[in-house]
């Protein structure tokens, strides 16, 4: 015959543990039910009554099966340099990540404690290492035969066009200018971008018309949507 299924609360067999989604209550010395995510233990179990669970209040949560007396408080509202990527619900904490053009300079267990604006590379310099969610942009000087004419956190150095006859030679911050109407070989028009990480934005496209107010997720300084060291003395 199959073993009889015990209903909580029940005394466990010596040496055995409580089942999944149950916990051992030291006071009652019984296996008792845990509360589901989004709930907490309002009344702990006794030898004759199981745990009484209640829903988490607003702005509090429990993410796991638990027997905590109070739900955890959700984190504070996301700061102006961040975007709320996960809302506070009864079952999950709020998660804030850096908005486009920023990276996480100081992480916390989930999300980001402090964002900083991505540096940009000035003309004559291209992106050697793009910004990521947790690291700043690294720039490098454009090598001979390449150029960048933008101030950008995404553009790399790209080759000068090759002319039949050069009118103006290219340099690190300017493409070559050809005398003939068409060069023998040229790059496709437009800036070359590195793959754009979640935390960067294009520095070139101008919306038309320009909006006069920022969306609620946008910041400054840097103040931002933009923002947050330097060659030899960088941070």
């Amino acid at each position: 015959l199959p073993a009889q299924v015990a209903f909580t609360p029940y005394a466990p067999e010596p040496g055995s543990t409580c089942r999944l989604r149950e916990y051992y209550d030291q006071t009652a010395q019984m296996c008792c039910s845990k509360c589901s995510p989004g709930q907490h233990a309002k009344v702990f179990c006794t030898k004759t009554s199981d745990t009484v669970c209640d829903s988490c209040e607003d702005s509090t949560y429990t993410q796991l099966w638990n027997w905590v007396p109070e739900c955890l408080s959700c984190g504070s509202r996301c700061s102006s340099d961040q975007v709320e990527t996960q809302a506070c619900t009864r079952e999950q904490n709020r998660i804030c990540t850096c908005r486009p053009g920023w990276y996480c300079a100081l992480s916390k267990q989930e999300g980001c404690r402090l964002c900083a604006p991505l540096r940009k590379c000035r003309p004559g310099f291209g992106v050697a290492r793009p910004g990521t969610e947790t690291s700043d942009v690294v720039c490098k000087p454009c090598a001979p035969g390449t150029f960048s004419n933008t101030t950008s956190s995404t553009d790399i150095c790209r080759p000068h066009q090759i002319c039949n006859v050069v009118a103006i030679p290219g340099n690190a911050s300017m493409d070559a200018v050809c005398t003939s109407t068409s060069p023998t070989r040229s790059m496709a028009p437009g800036a070359v971008h590195l793959p754009q990480p979640v935390s960067t934005r294009s520095q070139h496209t101008q919306p038309t018309p320009e909006p006069s107010t920022a969306p609620s997720t946008s910041f400054l300084l840097p103040m931002g949507p933009s923002p947050p060291a330097e060659g030899s003395t960088g941070d």
Partner: antibody, heavy 124, light 110 residues
């Protein structure tokens, strides 16, 4: 030489409007975040607002709804439109580039250069 | 909204003195802090960015330190041309900003 020059200041009556200009030379306005900062006579610096490279704008809480920032890329000029002016808006208004250049990097969180400023007086 | 509290609001010092100005942020701003010098009738001039990096052309007697919420501007040996007002500025110009500047510190001749 990288330079910003403000213009358009003057005397205006309370409730009136004024549009300030900030002309850039030596760099393209559209590739930098540009800020407006003001300074009332004998007082400290007060941030007014910013226009980011993408054209989005942000303002100090006290300036929202009354001030707007726009940009004319063809003229390489920035504008600050101020409406419903009050006596407490009397100040020198500066434009400042968000982006200090160093070692190939641009730091958008530092303001450099600044214009020379233009005085706005709101009085009846 | 990050608030910057600068102290002292004014100080008197003599040429050659070591001068220290502090700036406290109401919440952590990492190293996103700049210092400016302003002389009467002139626009502010950037001295230090990212808390401790000196801008080109600024004398080495100026130095910046700090991270998080507490920052310091130090002038190791005050010179006659250093008498001015100094401002700190945090690097966040977001959606809930009242001001990004501290209240200023006026350095006067004793």
């Amino acid at each position: 030489e990288v330079q910003l020059v403000e213009s358009g200041g003057g005397l205006v009556q309370p409730g009136g409007s004024l549009r300030l200009s900030c002309a850039a030379s030596g760099f393209s306005l559209s590739t930098y975040d540009i800020n407006w900062v003001r300074q009332a006579p004998g007082k400290g610096l007060e941030w007014v607002g910013i226009i980011y490279t993408g054209g989005i704008t942000n303002f100090a809480n006290w300036a929202k709804g009354r001030f707007t920032i726009s940009r004319d890329n063809s003229k390489n000029t920035l504008y600050l439109q101020m409406n419903s002016l009050r006596a407490e808006d009397t100040a020198v208004y500066y434009c400042a580039r968000g982006g200090y250049d160093s070692e190939g990097y641009v730091y958008p969180d530092a303001f450099d250069p600044w214009g020379q400023g233009t005085l706005v007086t709101v009085s009846s | 909204d990050i608030q910057m509290t600068q102290s002292p609001s004014s100080l008197s010092a003599s040429v050659g003195d070591r001068v220290t100005i502090t700036c406290q942020a109401s919440e952590s701003i990492s190293n996103l802090l700049a210092w400016y010098q302003q002389k009467p009738g002139k626009a502010p001039k950037l001295l230090i960015y990212r808390a401790s990096i000196l801008t080109s052309g600024v004398p080495s007697r100026f130095s910046g330190s700090g991270s998080g919420t507490d920052f310091t501007l130090t002038i190791s040996s005050l010179q006659p041309e250093d008498f001015a007002t100094y401002y700190c500025q945090h690097g966040y110009t977001g959606t809930n900003v009242q001001n990004v500047f501290g209240g200023g510190t006026k350095v006067e001749i004793k």
